[in-house]
């Protein structure tokens, strides 16, 4: 807390300008009017205040707005945003995308802090859903943003927002997240033709079910091995050798290098060795000829 002291004669601030950087903390407290500060917040960002001085300015705003700052002030916080705590931010009602962008800009190039996470959470909850413009903005600043959300939170993403998602935005998503995102992507891109559709849907295929992979295998998509390795194991297991060959096209040769890794390893164990041999890749571990495969899970479902 800064002690209440009278402002020295001639030092009362008439406007927020660079002369204030030479004020001591107590002088700022005594000589800067909080209402003046609030109306001239846009100037603060252009003045190289010390963090100690910013603490004093924040204290003045806190006294003026104990219930939380109005958006007109929030939008112009600039570096003062670096002094806010998550508790401060929870009092805010941020509705403008411009305000969100202005504050994210302050932290640009740095990893997401608890303050930024709180700000985004407040903003998205206020909007009710993660719309395309918001998602565009957030992934531009934080490519990993989408994958930081829980499956429950992702369920509020409308399919139209999926157009804003770039492949790198999904790099750190786990299968549970892709399970939620894939159906939305399928819906979003449903009117595209085959090759264009595959380019767009490719990043989301870690959430695709078997029937969709079977359908893709009929479309000459030439899926690369990196994408294939990210597919759900349970979705890959029912695919036949012929279907995998069609799905991968010329990339099928890459299976040999991945034969010890999931999902390739588990898929090989489910295929007849005769069928694997038709690929000519030397894949081993399939079911020997003459063996009968009983699908016990199917039997349990019937009983």
């Amino acid at each position: 807390e800064v002690e209440k002291t009278a402002c020295p004669s001639g030092k009362k601030a008439r406007e927020i300008d660079e002369s204030l950087i030479f004020y001591k903390k107590w002088e700022l407290e005594a000589c800067v009017d909080a209402a003046l500060l609030a109306t001239q917040m846009d100037r603060v960002n252009a003045i190289p205040f010390t963090y100690e001085q910013l603490d004093v300015l924040k204290h003045k705003l806190d006294e003026l707005y104990p219930q939380g700052y109005p958006e007109s002030v929030i939008q112009h916080l600039g570096y003062l945003f670096l002094k806010m705590s998550p508790e401060d931010i929870r009092k805010w009602n941020v509705t403008s995308l411009e305000t969100l962008k202005a504050l994210l800009e302050v932290n640009k190039g740095h990893e997401m802090s608890p303050q930024v996470a709180t700000l985004i959470d407040r903003f998205v909850k206020g909007r009710g859903q993660l719309d395309k413009d918001t998602l565009d903005t957030l992934t531009a600043f934080y490519p990993g943003y989408l994958c930081s959300l829980s499956p429950e939170e992702l369920s509020s993403v409308p399919p139209s927002s999926i157009w804003a998602v770039r492949p790198q935005d999904l790099d750190t998503c786990d299968p549970r997240q892709l399970d939620v995102l894939y159906p939305k992507a399928r819906l979003a891109f449903q009117n595209m033709n085959g090759s264009e559709y595959f380019v767009k849907i490719q990043s989301f295929l870690g959430g695709a079910p078997t029937e969709d992979l079977k359908a893709l295998s009929q479309q000459n998509v030439s899926m690369d091995l990196a994408t294939f390795m990210k597919l759900r194991t349970d979705a890959v297991l029912p695919l036949t050798v012929a279907e995998v060959q069609k799905l991968l096209g010329p990339h099928v040769e890459g299976l040999k290098a991945e034969e010890r890794h999931r999902p390739v390893r588990d898929w090989i164990l489910r295929q007849r060795q005769d069928d694997l041999d038709t690929l000519g890749l030397g894949l081993q571990g399939g079911i020997p000829n003459g063996y009968l495969v009983l699908d016990l899970s199917m039997q349990e479902a019937l009983s």
């Epitope: 570096y79 002094k83 932290n107």
Partner: nanobody
Framework: QVQLVESGGGLVQPGGSLRLSCAAS????????MRWYRQAPGKQRELVAT????????YAGSVKGRFTISRDNSKNTLLYLQMNSLRAEDTAVYIC????????????WGQGTQVTVSS
């Protein structure tokens, strides 16, 4: 973390000149604004000059027109203070300061370099 080391201080006659340097090491890419402060014996530390992250310079009234602050982001010696027309009242320990981006924004200080103006 940022480490700051000042150099260039010394004894100089009134009317003379000195050039102070501040060498920064560590996370120098995260530095935002840089400043020179001074502290005379028995007095409070006072801000002499600031150079902002965009290169704009600001001076205390007592040194305006005599001192020049500059910053070179391409070298580790990031901050300079060219002091001309020195006066006895400029005698002090001159301390380099830098602050960095992020939560919470941190302030870093050098140990200081003594400047004595005396005939």
């Amino acid at each position: 973390q940022v480490q700051l080391v000042e150099s260039g201080g010394g004894l100089v006659q009134p009317g003379g000149s000195l050039r102070l340097s501040c060498a920064a090491s560590g996370s120098i890419s995260s530095i935002r604004h840089m400043r020179w402060y001074r502290q005379a014996p028995g007095k409070q530390r006072e801000l002499v000059a600031t150079v902002s992250n965009d290169g704009s310079a600001y001076y205390a009234g007592s040194v305006k027109g005599r001192f020049t602050i500059s910053r070179d982001n391409s070298k580790n010696t990031l901050l300079y203070l060219q002091m001309n027309s020195l006066r006895a009242e400029d005698t002090a320990v001159y301390i380099c300061n830098a602050d960095t981006w992020g939560w919470p924004g941190a302030d870093y200080w050098g140990q200081g370099t003594q400047v004595t103006v005396s005939s």
